[in-house]
């Protein structure tokens, strides 16, 4: 099994309410195969924000084309940010399995939301 790192380059991102937030994440390898997921928070109560392989996430779009076979950029863009979106977001790599097995998490990116400029 190859050594894999999940890199979230920004420790924090600040966005005005109503704008879009870009949360960057890259992986250093495609192996082992398995999906990437984004969560807000940690532990059993963490909130799923985006799942690479299934689900409907209308406010979330991948920054790069996820259908590219060599894609290692798992950055996402969240639209129409509100204060309720504040928190720390983690990009997490899973290894395939039944169920998939969490392999490695990025260090997290804290999203803060500024008041909408008047």
């Amino acid at each position: 099994e190859e050594e894999l790192q999940v890199i979230q380059p920004e420790k924090s991102v600040s966005v005005a309410a109503g704008e879009s937030a870009t949360l960057n994440c890259t992986a250093t390898s495609l192996i082992p195969v398995g999906p990437i997921q984004w969560f807000r928070g940690v532990g059993p109560g963490r909130e799923l924000i985006y799942h690479q392989k299934e689900g409907h996430f209308p406010r979330v779009t991948p920054v790069s084309d996820p259908t590219k076979r060599n894609n290692m950029d798992f950055s996402i863009r969240i639209s129409n940010i509100t204060p309720a979106d504040a928190g720390t977001y983690y990009c997490v790599k899973f290894r395939k399995g039944s169920p998939d097995v969490e392999l490695k998490s990025g260090a997290g990116t804290e999203l803060s939301v500024r008041a909408k400029p008047s």
Epitope: L30, I31, P32, V33, K53, D65, T67, R69
Partner: antibody
Framework: DVQLVESGGGVVRPGESLRLSCAAS????????MSWVRQAPGKGLEWLAG????????YYIDSVKGRFTISRDNPKNSLYLQMSSLTAEDTAVYYC???????????WGLGTLVTVSS | ALTQPASVSANPGETVKITCSGG??????YAWYQQKSPGSAPVTVI????KRPSDIPSRFSGSASGSAATLIITGVRVEDEAVYYC???????????FGAGTTLTVL
């Protein structure tokens, strides 16, 4: 319902060219990677080429690199396979297939028969 | 290359297992494709090792471990007679491959 309909097959002479088309409906074509797979008479399935959802990235099996070109026109919901320098070994039923998130196939067309004969 | 048995036979109601070997567990996802007659459109019965499309009967299931994948048909029916192709996607090479196919005969 997802529907994939291939066309453009027929009888050609060795050395000639042919362009196959695949008309897609029932899903958001521009969101999915696509592939071409063929089956020679009495033989098994053989993957030929794949293309990312946006069309920027293409992938080929070694035996058709330089002779076959996969492309797509997302506004027309169409996938293409341009084949040149055809030989008798290219005689087969050619299928287009929609890719899953991890580049397997979930839906297949009915196929179009290509016969290369002098 | 993916390797699978050339043929398997079973009586109606029995459980059938078809194995597929040759892929690296860490880099390969498997799928199973059913083809009822040569030249007819394949049908995906399992993808992503164990995911069954919504229109496929629940008697079809899949698993993967080590370097092998298995298609399981629990309570096989006469209408399940077909050639079953194992397919793989290798994340190292970006290439799709298929096994040679297994002919399932229901006696």
């Amino acid at each position: 319902d997802v529907q994939l309909v291939e066309s453009g097959g027929g009888v050609v002479r060795p050395g000639e060219s042919l362009r196959l088309s695949c008309a897609a409906s029932g899903f958001t074509f521009s969101s999915y990677a696509m592939s071409w797979v063929r089956q020679a008479p009495g033989k098994g399935l053989e993957w030929l080429a794949g293309i990312s959802a946006g069309g920027s990235d293409t992938y080929y099996i070694d035996s058709v690199k330089g002779r076959f070109t996969i492309s797509r026109d997302n506004p027309k919901n169409s996938l293409y396979l341009q084949m040149s320098s055809l030989t008798a070994e290219d005689t087969a039923v050619y299928y287009c297939a929609r890719e899953t998130w991890n580049h397997l196939f979930d839906y297949w067309g009915l196929g179009t028969l290509v016969t290369v004969s002098s | 290359a993916l390797t699978q048995p050339a043929s398997v036979s079973a009586n109606p109601g029995e459980t059938v297992k078809i194995t597929c070997s040759g892929g690296d567990y860490y880099s390969t996802y498997y799928a199973w494709y059913q083809q009822k007659s040569p030249g007819s459109a394949p049908v995906t019965v399992i993808h992503s090792d164990d995911k069954r499309p919504s229109d496929i009967p629940s008697r079809f299931s899949g698993s993967a471990s080590g370097s092998a994948a298995t298609l399981i048909i629990t309570g096989v029916r006469v209408e399940d007679e077909a050639v079953y192709y194992c397919g793989g996607y290798d994340g190292r090479t970006y290439i799709n491959t298929f096994g040679a196919g297994t002919t399932l005969t229901v006696l």
